[in-house]
Every structure is written in C-alpha cells, then in structure tokens.
C-alpha cells in the first residue's frame, strides 16, 4: 500500500542496501524509488553527529516494512514503488547554505544561481552544482559557479556552508536545451569507453537503461545475432569528455544511440512493455507462481513490490488447468544478469515503472480520420472552463499537464473576480453530459502571468490550480509540455480542438470539435497583421485560404502536435482576426517558451 | 583519489629561471584552483599564488614580477615558473587545491636549492 | 596586502589541555580564516577553513572562531599527536596570505 507519510524522529533498524547524500527527507525519498531494490530509507537531518548529517540509507526488506525505533534527527519513509500517482525525478529546489560535494569539473563566474542552474542543466555532464552568492566571505569565490558530476549523479556528501546554495540540473524536469537525438542506428558501434554494461532483450530497452543511468550519455547493443556469444544482449553505456562518440564503427548485429536524458518528458523511457517471446530472463527468483500466460504472469510481476521482471513458462501438459509456470525475478540494477534463448518461454519486466514515465506518453485512442467531432478518449487532455456566475457557461477550453494543474488562457479571466465561480470538467465529450450533479474540479487559484496585458500582445497563459487531484483514466490524462530541447522540430501533425463557435456569429458547439490545422511560419503569419506583432512567444496555425480554424469559445484549449507518436502541447489558442479567414492563421502562445514559467509556478506552489 | 605531486629541478644557479610542475589526478583543472606556496628551511608558509579553473590568475604582490603560473587542463599538469632566481628562494614549494580559499590537498612539495 | 600576525611563536601544554591559539588580521577579513596543522618532514594539512567549518576527518577538538580582524583556533584536550605548529591563513582576499605560525610543544 502507498505510504506517502514522513516519519520525524524515527529510524528503521536493519535492511541498508546503500548510504547515500541527500539534501532533504524529501529527495531521499525520490532516490530510494529510483533505486531498483530500495523500498524503505532513513535520512539524518541535523543530529547529534554531524558525520551523519545528511545520509540517506536504502532500505530493502522480504517483507516490505522494518522495525521503527526512535532517533532524533532520523526522518523515515517508503519508497513511492508502491504508489500509483505519478513519480518525477525533477528536483527544481534550490538548497542555501548546502555543499554539494562531487567532481567539481568546470568554474566560473555567474550573475546568480538560476544562471549557475541553467548553466548545469544544459551541460551535459552537470548533475548538481553549488553557487556561491555574492555575500560569501572569500571576496574572490563570490559569483563563482562550480558545475559537479559523480559516478552516481549524487552528491558524495553535503556539508553546511554558509552563503552558498546547491541545486540539481533541469535535465529530468525536461528543461534543457541541449539537442536529443532519438535515432537508433544500426550496424553501428560507437568506440568510446565504457563506464557500465547490463543486459537488455533489444536497443529500445538499452537506450532506456542509458537513459536512466546517471553517466551514460550513448551506449552500443549487441543483439542476439551478434558473432560473439559471450556479448550477445549486451548494453554497453559509454560516455566521453566531448559528450559525443568519438568513432563509429561499422558492425552488423549491433545498434548504436543515444541517452534521451534531455527529452525525457517525450517518449517512455522507464517502462517496458513489451514481451520477448522464446527469451529467458535470469535473475534472483523470487517467488514462482501459476499463472494463465504472460500477460497474467506480467501484471503478478507488477503486483509484486519486488519485482523487477519475470519469465513465463507456458505449461507442458493440461493437468494444472493449463497454468504455465512465472517466475519472479530480481537482480541488483533491475536488468538480468543473464539472457537465454531457445527455451520457449516469455520474458518481460514490471509495469510498476510504467508511472515513472511521464503520464502524458502513454498512448491514447487512435484518431478518428475525417469529420469534425470528436469520440470519447481522443483528446483526454481538453477540459471546459465553466464560469457559474450569472449563469453557468461554457467560458473556455484548458489542457490537463498534471494532475492538479490546467494550462490555459490568460484573456479568459479579464472578468474573473473570484477562482470560487469556476469549474472545471475533463472526461467530457459533450456539453449537454453537464448536469448539476455532474462531477467537477473547484479552482484553488488562478495563476495569470505577470506580463500579460492582453492576449494580442503575448503572455496570454494561465495556470488553474485544482481544489483535488485528477486520477487519470483513458477519458481524463495530460498532454506533454513540448521539451526545450526540441524547439526547433518541425511538427506536420496538429489539431485544434475546442467547443467553440463554428463561424463566427454562431454559439458554443455541443460535441468537442476539432481540426487538424498546419503550422506556418511567424513571417507568415506577421504578414497577415501588419498592425500587431506577432513575436517569438507566439506561434500561428492555419490553412492560407482560411476555413478551418480556432475561434470564440475555443481560447485557452490546446493546439496539439503529435510528435515521435506522443501528443504535445505546442500552443494555446489565443487570438486572431475573425476566424477562419483567409491569410489570417490562428495566433497560439507558444508553449515551449513558457516551460520554465509553468515548472516555477507548479514548484512554488 | 585525490593527488598532486611537485616536480622540480632540485638545484638552480643564481639568476637563473626555475620552472616547477605539479601534475594532479582524481579530480579536473578546470573544476578547481591551485595555488602555489613556499616554505623556506625553519621558516613559515608564504603564499605564492595561483590559478583558477577558468584559467585566471593572482600572484603575490611581492613577486609578481618574477612569477609566473600557467596550466595544461589535458595533461592536468600546472607550472609554476620563477625568473631571476636569489639564494633566498630556496625553499620547499608545494602545490595545493583550493577550496574556497583554503587548501585542501597539497602535494609532498619539491626542495629547490639556489646555489652556485 | 593582508598582513596576519600570530602573536605566539610557541605555546607549551600538556595532554589533556585545552589550548587558544591567536591570530589577528590587519584588516576585516570577514570569516575567511583557515587553520593548518604542519608536523616536521610533513605537507600542512587543512583543519579548519572559513573560521569554524571542520575539514573532513578532522576531529571535533579542533574548533575556531572568530570574525573581522581577530580568529581563535582551540584545541579542547590535546593529544600527544597534536603537537606541531599552526598557521592561520586569511582566504578573503588575494593575495591571500598566512599568519608566522605558532609551534605547539610539549610543557
């Protein structure tokens, strides 16, 4: 069950697997989920013994709890594993007074920690940095930026400094800008030095496993095909000073790529779903089960804390009610420590890592090509905006990011007074499905941003923190932020949706309209307003010869690009002249512009 | 781990130049400063300077005409190179990682001794 | 320049004493003061850096204190190993600089 309580002055006795550092309680509890066996963790904050301030201990144990005994200091908890919200290792806290101590491998001078952070997160060596602000008492160390990086990407130990403050690169939260390359290439082996190597069933699960190291910056697979036995299914992670490979190989049976470490909000990196049929997976045995066939063997897997992947034995003979044998297995990093073939079982991992992947990746319904309305599930992230006040109405259209926050319009809300009179619905195909007992999400707070003016001069964006937190389900799921990294894609596949007006003079439509619209270029798009300007905060849709478009009612809703087969949140719709008219695009915020706005505002509150 | 080691001539005529290296390892030039620090026969400790890991430098001001301090970041190697050299430079030298001013690690030092 | 002055060439004491060692700056140096401990034929060695932070390893009787012109370094029990000398030195500004040093020795 999920624990998600802290427990102050509190130790649990036994099961340490690994001490690492951390800054809080709170990251403590984030590494041990990362960990592949931590299950339970006990941080010392300041204490009688200041050799044990900050320790993190990972804790595993058979029977998922450990005896708790008093300890001042000793903050204990549970790992997230056995939670099922959403799990980030985004860590945007910035620590005073704290050093961070790991390689320093690069200093120099920044005007303030946000610079020296932003400098991290877009290096690509950087996993945590410390700052000394301008206040620290050795004159010529003020201002001074110290980017770090450890074997582990955490730090060896953190000591109280004061006038200094330490912080962890952006990567994980999807903020940096250096380039992501997804490409797989094959009859390729990249040269470079090996910092570590498991074993994985395909590239897909090698690059995920890069991905999720701390060094590994692109790796080389060997598949199953691969001449020499003893390399057959190895992932080897590799890493280099440059950050790129320094030689290319040319090798058949072999696949070549890189970490996607810098667009880890854009595709699943964590979760494997897939099964590797006549494929054997060896590990640590856990528990063997009956099961009906590998995807009942796959979901026990799941169940099952412990867990970390499995194999499934189709049964040889019909006398256990044609139960096939599931072994549960785990090993100490999470992969086998041995792959088999030929043995006509079913191979696979757990699902439980499926939540550390952003919610926003999993697949949804496929579209429905042509017309105009929309099914059930197409665009589960589209909510409406009701407004009760004087009548409840329809006001705008809002994208589900997470699970207690929407993103939307800031124009919405010129004559908003109060969050009290606001409603939000997601799931909803159809207006007419509202009815006064139908569930809604009260708004906590409305987060307009600072430089908005009006929707045709920019920053027309708004946040709407929920009153309770949205479960998702196929009907009701985020949309993904597009990542800094990939700012220059160019997408060919997106749609407007909104329960807006079809025309001009016309009313809110009851089914969920939407149309797919191109993208055009900002020139373009400044030529159709020569009174307005149309900056780089904005981004404009439509076809030249007008017709299909966003228009009244739709403002605030999304414009959604599909991309690497996952759905991202490109723009919101703002404004435009009339609508659908000729050589006048829809003008959108530009989202990916206000990524960093959208993590501040979420973080801090 | 952690280590830096002085290399030097061990004896220098007067007037002449001394070049000094202190090659490290477990750790980058370019992610720390090193200083250079002198320790004559009984005497105490004199500070001589250093080189950050942005490449900048700082000499003490008594000697800054005479030193000069230099770094290669790929062989992780700092020099230290000292003209018109007196008998009263004879000395120990060390090299040492800052850290934040202080030093944390330091090197065995080298004995220089200006003879003729 | 800074010019850190340690007033004691030499201090005696014996086991088990507590020990103050002084050092005086001829200007604010805010708190960064450092404190090193050189035994004969040895390299100094980092105990104390920005006036009371303890270098890593060092143990908790050595502490310091101090701010703007005048630093203390304390030893609360000395032990035999703690005979050598010690050297302030002012890390607030370069050219940094050390303090003469004070010889611990033996009553």
């Known amino acids: 069950e999920c624990m998600t309580k802290l427990f102050q002055d509190t130790y649990f006795h036994g099961g340490d697997i690994a001490v690492v550092f951390t800054p809080s309680a709170k990251h403590c509890q984030v590494v041990c989920t990362h960990h592949p066996r931590c299950l339970l963790f006990t941080f010392m904050a300041e204490s009688e013994d200041p050799t044990k301030w900050f320790t993190c201990t990972l804790k595993d144990s058979v029977t998922e709890t450990l005896p708790m005994l008093n300890m001042a200091g000793a903050i204990s908890g549970y790992s997230f594993k056995q939670c099922s919200h959403q799990i980030s290792a985004c860590n945007t806290n910035v620590y005073v007074d704290l050093d961070m101590k790991g390689v320093n491998y690069n200093s120099s001078v920044s005007k303030s920690a946000q610079e020296c952070q932003e400098r991290c997160t877009n290096d690509m060596h950087c996993h945590f940095f410390t700052y000394a602000t301008r206040h620290f008492p050795s004159v010529k160390h003020r201002n001074v930026c110290l980017l770090k990086y450890t074997q582990t990407g955490i730090p060896t130990s953190i000591k109280k400094l004061t006038d200094v403050v330490s912080g962890f690169s952006l990567k994980s939260c999807a903020l940096s800008n250096l380039a992501c390359i997804r490409d797989i290439f094959p009859t390729t082996v990249f040269a470079d030095s090996n910092i570590d190597s498991v074993m994985a069933p395909d590239a897909f699960v090698c690059r995920s496993i890069c991905t999720h190291h701390p060094n590994c910056l692109f790796f080389t697979f060997f598949s199953q095909e691969w001449p020499t036995e003893s390399e057959r299914n190895l992932c080897l992670l590799k890493t280099s000073n440059s950050g790129l490979p320094s030689t290319r190989i040319r090798k058949n049976k072999a696949f070549s790529g890189f970490s996607l470490q810098n667009c880890r909000h854009s595709i699943p990196v964590f979760c494997h779903s897939s099964f590797y049929h006549d494929t054997e997976f060896l590990g640590e045995e856990l528990d063997i089960v009956g099961e009906n066939g590998h995807e009942a063997c796959q979901k026990t897997c799941t169940n099952t804390i412990r867990c970390q992947f499995f194999t499934y034995s189709p049964s040889q003979e019909s006398c256990n009610g044609g139960k096939g044998k599931c072994y549960l297995k785990l090993s100490s990093n999470g992969s086998p420590t041995k792959i088999l073939h030929g043995r006509g079982s079913i191979s696979g991992y757990t699902l439980r890592l499926c939540k550390m992947d952003n919610a926003c990746t999993t697949k949804i319904k496929p579209r429905i090509v042509g017309g105009t309305k929309s099914v059930l599930g197409e665009w589960p992230w589209q909510i409406t905006v009701h407004i009760t006040s004087p009548t409840q109405r329809h006001l705008c259209g809002g994208s589900i990011i997470g699970n207690q926050w929407i993103l939307t319009a800031a124009h919405c809300f010129n004559e908003v007074e109060s969050p009290r009179i606001l409603r939000v619905y997601s799931g909803i195909l159809n207006q007419s499905e509202i009815k006064e007992d139908t569930f809604f999400f009260g708004v906590q707070e409305v987060i307009i941003h600072d430089q908005f003016e009006a929707a045709e001069t920019g920053y027309d964006i708004a946040l709407l923190k929920l009153e309770t937190t949205i479960n998702y389900t196929d009907s009701q799921r985020p949309i993904c932020l597009p990542s800094k990294g990939d700012r220059n894609v160019m997408y060919t596949d997106c749609w407007v949706t909104g329960w807006g007006y079809t025309k001009l003079r016309d009313k809110i439509q009851n089914t969920l309209q939407k149309a797919k619209i191109p993208l055009v270029t900002n020139e373009e798009c400044q030529a159709g307003y020569r009174s307005h300007k149309i900056t780089n905060k904005m981004i404009c849709a439509g076809y030249k010869e007008g017709g299909k478009d966003a228009c009244k009612g739709d403002s605030g809703g999304p414009l959604s690009c599909k991309h690497n087969e996952v759905w991202h949140l490109v723009g919101i719709t703002s404004w435009g002249e009339g609508c659908a008219q000729r050589e006048r695009p829809g003008v959108y915020t530009r989202v990916v512009e206000y990524v960093d706005w959208i993590l501040e505002k979420t973080q801090e509150a | 781990q952690v280590q830096l080691e002085e290399s030097g001539p061990g004896l220098v005529a007067p007037s002449q130049s001394l070049s000094i290296t202190c090659t490290v390892s477990?750790?980058?030039?370019?992610?720390?400063?090193i200083y250079w620090v002198r320790q004559p026969p009984g005497k105490g400790l004199e500070w001589l300077g250093m080189?950050?890991?942005?490449?900048?430098?700082d000499y003490n001001s008594a000697l800054k005409s005479r030193l000069s301090i230099s770094k290669d970041n790929s062989k992780s190697q700092v020099f230290l190179k000292m003209n018109s050299l007196q008998t009263d430079d004879t000395a120990r030298y060390y090299c040492?990682?800052?850290?934040?001013?202080?030093?944390?690690?330091w090197g065995q030092g080298t004995t220089l001794t200006v003879s003729s | 320049d800074i010019v850190m002055t340690q007033s004691h060439k030499f201090m005696s004491t014996s086991v088990g004493d507590r020990v103050s060692i002084t050092c005086k700056a001829s200007?604010?140096?805010?708190?960064?003061v450092a404190w090193y401990q050189q035994k004969p034929g040895q390299s100094p060695k980092l105990l104390i850096y920005?006036?009371?932070y303890r270098n890593t390893g060092v143990p908790d009787r050595f502490t310091g204190s101090g701010s703007g012109t005048d630093f203390t370094f304390t030893i609360s029990s000395v032990q035999a190993e703690d005979l050598a000398v010690y050297y302030c030195?002012?890390?607030?500004?370069?050219?940094?600089?050390f303090g003469g040093g004070t010889k611990l020795e033996r009553l």
């Open positions: 920005l006036t009371s």
């Open positions: 080189i950050w890991g942005d490449g900048r430098t």
């Open positions: 477990g750790f980058s030039l370019t992610g720390y400063g």
């Open positions: 200007q604010d140096v805010s708190t960064a």
């Open positions: 040492a990682r800052d850290y934040y001013g202080s030093k944390d690690y």
């Open positions: 030195q002012q890390h607030y500004k370069t050219p940094y600089s």
